[in-house]
Interface confidence: low
């Protein structure tokens, strides 16, 4: 079975961990696919390790475990995320997470944030 938090929220500009937990007494995980709606985010395979889709490579970090850390979130990242566990034997198990990206608390308070970069 797949156990996951069905609904999670995070702040714009922040990061979030997408995590599915697979439990079985007999099946071995051979591959995990992560998708944002229908778009591939990342794939983990037992022998070949992680592959992150190039379009997300600057914002998606593999882990912890078989999950993903999604960084620099934007409002457009709000939506459904799916983990697909390929197991042997036992077939395919899927989990769903709904991520809601909210405005940062400072923005909601009407405060503008400025950051100056040092010259040189």
């Amino acid at each position: 079975t797949i156990d996951t938090k069905r609904n999670i929220s995070a702040e714009e500009g922040g990061s979030v961990i997408l995590q599915c937990h697979f439990s079985s007494d007999t099946a071995e995980v051979t591959q995990v696919d992560w998708k944002q709606q229908d778009q591939l985010l990342a794939i983990y395979s037992v022998d070949l390790g992680w592959h992150v889709a190039s379009v997300f490579s600057d914002r998606v970090v593999p882990g912890p475990s078989l999950g993903l850390t999604f960084q620099s979130l934007t409002m457009n990242d709000t939506g459904e995320y799916f983990c697909t566990y390929h197991t042997y034997p036992g077939g395919i198990y899927k989990g769903r997470i709904f991520l809601k990206v909210q405005e940062s608390s400072d923005d909601r308070n009407g405060l503008a944030q400025f950051q100056t970069a040092p010259l040189g």
Partner: antibody, heavy 116, light 110 residues
Framework: QVQLQESGPGLVKPSETLSLTCTVS????????MSWIRQPPGKGLEWIGI?????NTYYANWAKGRVTISKSSNQVSLKLSSVTAADTAVYYC????????????WGQGTLVTVSS | DIQMTQSPSSLSASVGDRVTITCQAS??????LAWYQQKPGKAPKLLIY???TLASGVPSRFSGSGSGTDFTLTISSLQPEDFATYYC????????????FGQGTKVEIK
């Protein structure tokens, strides 16, 4: 250069175990996937199974319980038990087969006939 | 299980013809697809991997396209040495699979 060579008996009796060896040169099995494929006379390619770089094995549904793939330093072995005439085929080994760059190269193949 | 379905199973064509072979996967395999050519009595030869990348030494008249579930092998101008059987192969998943290959397409002389 990369080379693969299958070897083993060309004739196996029904109910016995088919044993083949694929000897490789020009690359390391410790960082490669190796696949076994067979082709019955006049028919298409049938995948048998694969062994990963770390020794993990995955077998075709039809072969589970009958097939064992293993490897040593420069050889990959295939054992198929309880053979019948339907297992008569040309057997190939090939490098790759899972999230790689295709199966390449292939051995030349060896014909195994199951008959009493 | 992922099933690979090739079409047509055979075709007749003339030298110089443009030939197209299709391969359909029963589920999304992204770009994890390879194409092979096999001539009678010989081992298969890799033509294309990752759906569209030409293998080393393969003539540029061969090309591959597609992703997800639908893939195509195209021979832009058929040559005498291209009469053979062609197979697609999914590389996406090896657990819980019956066969990674399509059933083959035989290209014959018209």
């Amino acid at each position: 250069q990369v080379q693969l060579q299958e070897s083993g008996p060309g004739l196996v009796k029904p109910s016995e175990t088919l044993s083949l060896t694929c000897t490789v040169s020009g690359f390391s099995l410790s960082s490669s996937y190796m696949s076994w494929i067979r082709q019955p006379p006049g028919k298409g390619l049938e995948w048998i199974g694969i062994i990963g770089s770390n020794g993990n094995t995955y077998y075709a549904n039809w072969a589970k319980g009958r097939v064992t793939i293993s490897k040593s330093s420069n050889q990959v072995s295939l054992k198929l038990s309880s053979v019948t005439a339907a297992d008569t085929a040309v057997y190939y080994c090939a490098r790759g087969g899972y999230r790689t760059s295709g199966m390449d190269p292939w051995g030349q193949g060896t014909l195994v006939t199951v008959s009493s | 299980d992922i099933q690979m379905t090739q079409s047509p199973s055979s075709l007749s064509a003339s030298v110089g013809d443009r030939v197209t072979i299709t391969c359909q996967a029963s589920q999304n395999i992204y770009s994890d697809l390879a194409w092979y050519q096999q001539k009678p009595g010989k081992a298969p030869k890799l033509l294309i991997y990752r759906a569209s990348t030409l293998a080393s030494g393969v003539p540029s008249r061969f090309s591959g396209s597609g992703s997800g579930t639908d893939f195509t092998l195209t021979i832009s101008s058929l040559q005498p040495e291209d009469f053979a059987t062609y197979y697609c192969q999914q590389e996406h998943l090896v657990a819980w699979i019956y066969n990674v290959f399509g059933q083959g397409t035989k290209v014959e002389i018209k």
